[in-house]
């Protein structure tokens, strides 16, 4: 139904609404230098930006949340920009028996929505 | 490993951190009175509260986000409180041919975490 359709154009201006942004971080930044051996520099895609009414609503709950935030802003928070999907990353890290490669499926965001 | 474990005790005081809260809303509040027939009053469980460092981290990405927010607060937002699961709700609503019952799986939150 029409009432459930989220919108994709940002009413706040370019770059202001929920989107994917790359943040560069070292293992030291993450506090991982004692157990992760590589990569030593990570390109971390993260979800940033605001979630104005109906923008990229994740689901029915997010649409309701946006509506109720308009009515009760002190009681109900606005939806916020979080990952909708992730892309895997391989880390080489220490193990008790030496070194291993492990894929992390929930480390780097691939898409964002408002939840 | 220890570095990936989120914590469950709220350092900000009771009720301040990310949790499930029930918000009462009418069909009028939601703008649904023209197409939903019942229930006319909904008990909507929503996720509210703050996400201090490591609190109920959804996954590795959320842990990283919390860490980078501490280092670059202007660039990286803090994790925010969103549903981790939903509970289904049945709505009776109008259709072109009359009335039908429909289950919505993503309308009411059942659990919350920081993402």
């Amino acid at each position: 139904s029409a009432h459930l359709h989220p919108r994709d154009s940002c009413p706040l201006g370019p770059g202001r609404c929920c989107h994917l942004e790359t943040v560069q971080a070292t293992l030291e930044d993450l506090g991982w230098s004692d157990w992760v051996l590589s990569p030593r520099q990570l390109q971390l895609s993260m979800c940033v930006g605001e979630c104005p009414h109906l923008y990229r609503s994740a689901n029915t709950h997010a649409l309701i949340k946006a509506r109720l935030h308009g009515l009760q802003p002190d009681r109900v928070p606005a939806p916020c920009c979080v990952p909708s999907s992730y892309t895997p990353v391989v880390l080489m890290h220490r193990t008790d028996s030496g070194v291993s490669l492990q894929t992390y499926d929930d480390l780097v965001a691939q898409g964002c929505h408002c939840a | 490993s220890a570095h990936l474990h989120p914590r469950d005790s709220c350092p900000l005081g009771p009720g301040r951190c990310c949790h499930l809260e029930t918000v009462q809303a009418t069909l009028e509040d939601l703008g649904w009175s023209d197409w939903v027939l019942s229930p006319r009053q909904l008990q909507l469980s929503m996720c509210v509260g703050e996400c201090p460092h490591l609190y109920r981290s959804a996954n590795t990405h959320a842990l990283i986000k919390a860490r980078l927010h501490g280092l670059q607060p202007d660039r990286v937002p803090a994790p925010c409180c969103v549903p981790s699961s939903y509970t289904p709700v049945v709505l009776m609503h109008r259709t072109d041919s009359g009335v039908s019952l429909q289950t919505y799986d993503d309308l009411v939150a059942q659990g919350c975490h920081c993402a």
């Epitope: 790359t22 051996l37 520099q41 892309t87 895997p88 992390y104 480390l107 780097v108 | -």
Partner: antibody, heavy 119, light 112 residues
Framework: QVQLQESGPGLVKPSQTLSLTCTVS??????????WSWIRQHPGKGLEWIGA???????YYNPSLKSRVTISVDTSKNQFSLKLSSVTAADTAVYYC???????????WGQGTLVTVSS | DIVMTQSPLSLPVTPGEPASISCRSS???????????LDWYLQKPGQSPQLLIY???NRASGVPDRFSGSGSGTDFTLKISRVEAEDVGVYYC?????????FGGGTKVEIK
């Protein structure tokens, strides 16, 4: 299992742009989050790392070649590509694509393709 | 760039006998995490290089245990405990501590 295969012209004229593609089969280029590198080997000589790209499109280049190199990824075709501009005879080499963790641990290599720069 | 120097250039070997290749870097490859960022590769005749050892001493998957890597800082050694005929080819060390990664000039191992 995952395999890499280089393709492109075997002969390029001086001053032109060398273009090569590495096709990944048996797995998705965007799954696993590896670094995808290009490495070359001049005839009878050692190995030289050219650069790498990650799933997100972020690139890393050897400073000695940076001004002439472009590496890109096409996830829809499961390929990544190398472009080397303004080539000279010194760019004649076997070009390999490889998968690594950062710029190390190249555990998977293509079979290599010889590119000759000559008029 | 970090310069990698290998010796000898050529190494004639007898099957069943041990062999040793040296690699020296122009600066220390020892990271503060305690690991040496050095890989060893073997390029068999007419083939692509294959990873043997990573992070100084860790054998890559499928590599026979007759291959071992040792050393720290600037001096590294690849040892083959008992050379087999299939071990012939050019061995390269590669530093991965700093970008760009750089390779040694190679050591050609051939059967006497």
């Amino acid at each position: 299992q995952v395999q890499l295969q280089e393709s492109g012209p075997g002969l390029v004229k001086p001053s032109q742009t060398l273009s090569l593609t590495c096709t990944v089969s048996g797995g998705s280029i965007s799954s696993g989050g590896y670094y995808w590198s290009w490495i070359r080997q001049h005839p009878g000589k050692g190995l030289e790392w050219i650069g790498a790209i990650v799933y997100s499109g972020h690139t890393y280049y050897n400073p000695s070649l940076k001004s002439r190199v472009t590496i890109s990824v096409d996830t829809s075709k499961n390929q990544f590509s190398l472009k080397l501009s303004s080539v000279t005879a010194a760019d004649t080499a076997v070009y390999y694509c490889a998968r690594g963790v950062e710029y190390q641990h190249f555990s998977l290599w293509g079979q290599g393709t010889l590119v000759t720069v000559s008029s | 760039d970090i310069v990698m120097t290998q010796s000898p250039l050529s190494l004639p070997v007898t099957p069943g006998e041990p062999a040793s290749i040296s690699c020296r870097s122009s600066q220390s490859l020892l990271h503060s995490n305690g690991y040496n960022y050095l890989d060893w590769y073997l390029q068999k005749p007419g083939q692509s290089p294959q990873l043997l050892i990573y992070l100084g001493s860790n054998r890559a998957s499928g590599v026979p245990d007759r291959f071992s890597g040792s050393g720290s800082g600037t001096d590294f050694t690849l040892k083959i405990s008992r050379v087999e005929a299939e071990d012939v080819g050019v061995y390269y060390c590669m530093q991965t501590l700093e970008a760009p990664p750089t390779f040694g000039g190679g050591t050609k191992v051939e059967i006497k």
